[in-house]
């Protein structure tokens, strides 16, 4: 009874086609596989960034895999081939592991590379990305960021830099079709007389980083004796009703302050016929329905309302 | 397997010029990048420079002006060029192989004396 | 530049003994970029810690590192005969990069 063995899969390697992080991962079948012609191989791939605690894992009959990597550090993979226990008569059989590496050979001393970069999308329509010089870097140096979405043919790069001494430190995307909900790869590179310049990389999903106009329109209703009732419009933009979470803060007569975070473009709150001003603002933020994060919008107009019978509705700017 | 060996050192007189060379071999310069790091008898290290796999140089800028890296990726080499040599000078100097931003791998050394 | 400061320059110690080794740097340097090396006589230094708490290839786990900002410690949890050496810690976060100044640590 000869025991059943494998080979690894060839020609195992990471390639990188120029889309800043997005990487594939391919090979070939292993070697002598004639003997298990009736057989659908499969492969293990294991794969993740050097230094992350865990692998990924997928398990695959195709002789390639697409992901994104943070190209600031390595990634290292492996891979080996599987035979189905329909195939063997018995247990799965597993191969040895091929390996490979892939890192972007740096240039240029870490401190060299932007500081403090931050990219904001503006009511999930326009975004902005901005940045700081790398530490001791002369105003020689220019940095030039470089973009790339699935759906993009290659990378772009900036055409709308923000300038300061001469200096790009921000720029100013166009219109970005079909570009949320993936990852949205850039890299900031940079070029000195003076010395090499560090790259960096950032990965992120447009839609988490969406900062939306405040809300528009503060109004109150009184309900009742005891109620009133705040309502404001949904700022103008793409962005529907059913992403919305909102924040209020209500100021009663200078001193009581209310905050409140809520779902609606309303709330009831509670007064007392002693109550002589109310004040409130409103700012909103894309909620957890249609992203994982997101940044709040500035604070809205204030709205107060005030006079002895707060029932006259003496509605002040 | 990696190594990296140095040679080239030797007795030089003050003003002088010196080239150190730095065989690697297990890896490819156009893959990593090597810096030179020097030691003087008894003391600690001090970085002098590297020489970037894309072939651009960072230097320590109090050595910028008298000592110059270059390579040749065809003879998977590193060069260490030293002008206008003073006493302090005097050293063992090392080849080092960047990885990751950390010098994973050393050489042995060449021994470097400037003095009259 | 940034200044290293290692303390002390150097101890005695014996075999089974632990070893606690302390890095100054003048200015915040990341833990990415803070390595230690181990230098024994008339060898060529040898990376012993990468990123302030990661052994590199090859090294017995009673040697750790940790710290962060303008701190740092290489510690020998049960001192052996190999491990007489001088150590010395290294920023490569800012032009130029830096050593220690080295901790020879001696057999007691």
């Known amino acids: 009874d000869t025991e059943i063995k494998v080979n690894p899969p060839q020609d195992f390697e990471i390639v990188d086609p120029g889309y800043l992080g997005y990487l594939y991962l391919q090979w070939q079948p292993p070697l002598s596989l004639d003997h298990f012609k009736e057989c659908t191989v499969e492969y293990e791939l294991k794969y993740r960034n050097i230094g992350s605690e865990t692998w990924k894992t997928i398990i695959t009959k195709n002789l390639h895999y697409k992901d994104g990597f943070d190209l600031n550090k390595g990634i290292e993979a492996k891979i080996h081939t599987l035979l189905p226990w329909q195939c063997t008569n018995g247990s799965e059989v597993q191969s040895s592991w091929a390996e490979t590496t892939y890192w972007i050979s740096p240039q240029g001393i870490p401190e060299t590379k932007v500081q403090d970069m931050d990219c904001v999308y503006y009511n999930w329509q326009y975004l902005l990305c901005s940045w700081k010089p790398g530490i001791g870097v002369l105003l020689d140096t220019n940095y030039n960021l470089f973009y790339w979405y699935e759906g993009l043919d290659h990378a772009l790069q900036c055409v709308d830099y923000i300038k300061a001494d001469g200096q790009n430190i921000g720029c100013r995307f166009p219109y970005l079709e079909a570009s949320d909900y993936k990852d949205f790869y850039i890299c900031v590179n940079g070029s000195s007389e003076n010395k090499p310049i560090r790259s960096s990389y950032f990965t992120f999903q447009l839609q988490n980083i969406v900062k939306p106009l405040p809300p528009v329109y503060l109004t109150f209703t009184r309900e009742s004796s005891c109620e009133i009732k705040l309502k404001w419009s949904i700022p103008l933009g793409p962005i529907p009703a059913r992403c919305f979470d909102y924040e209020i803060e209500i100021r009663e007569d200078d001193t009581t302050l209310v905050t409140a975070t809520v779902e609606n473009e309303t709330y009831t709150l509670k007064t007392t016929n002693e109550t002589r001003q109310l004040c409130f603002v409103v700012r909103s933020k894309v909620n957890i329905y249609c992203s994982d994060d997101g940044i709040w919008s500035e604070w809205s107009d204030k709205q107060c309302w005030e006079g002895e019978d707060l029932s006259k509705k003496t509605l002040l700017r | 397997e990696v190594q990296l060996v140095e040679s080239g050192g030797g007795l030089v007189q003050p003003g002088g010029s010196l080239r150190l060379s730095c065989a690697a071999s297990?890896?490819?310069?156009?893959?990593?990048?090597v810096h030179w790091v020097r030691q003087a008898p008894g003391k600690g290290l001090e970085w002098v420079g590297v020489?970037?796999?894309?072939?651009?140089?960072d230097y320590n800028s109090a050595l910028m002006s008298r000592f110059t890296i270059s390579k040749d990726n065809a003879k998977n080499s590193l060069y260490l060029q030293m002008n206008s040599l003073r006493a302090e000078d005097t050293a063992v100097y090392y080849c080092?192989?960047?990885?990751?931003?950390?010098?994973?791998?050393w050489g042995q050394g060449t021994l470097v004396t400037v003095s009259s | 530049d940034i200044q290293m400061t290692q303390s002390p320059s150097s101890l005695s110690a014996s075999v089974g003994d632990r070893v606690t080794i302390t890095c100054t740097a003048s200015?915040?340097?990341?833990?990415?970029?803070l390595h230690w090396y181990q230098q024994k006589p008339g060898s060529s230094p040898k990376l012993l810690i990468y990123?302030?708490?990661n052994l590199a290839s090859g090294v017995p786990s009673r040697f750790s590192g940790s710290g962060s900002g303008t701190s740092f410690t290489l510690t020998i949890s049960s001192l052996q005969p190999e491990d007489f050496a001088t150590y010395y810690c290294?920023?490569?976060?800012?032009?130029?990069?830096?050593f220690g100044g080295g901790t020879k640590v001696e057999i007691k």
């Open positions: 297990g890896f490819s310069l156009t893959k990593y990048g």
């Open positions: 080092a192989r960047d990885h990751r931003d950390a010098m994973d791998y």
């Open positions: 290294h920023q490569y976060h800012r032009s130029p990069l830096t």
């Open positions: 200015l915040s340097v990341s833990s990415t970029y």
């Open positions: 020489k970037w796999a894309g072939g651009s140089t």
């Open positions: 990123s302030t708490s």
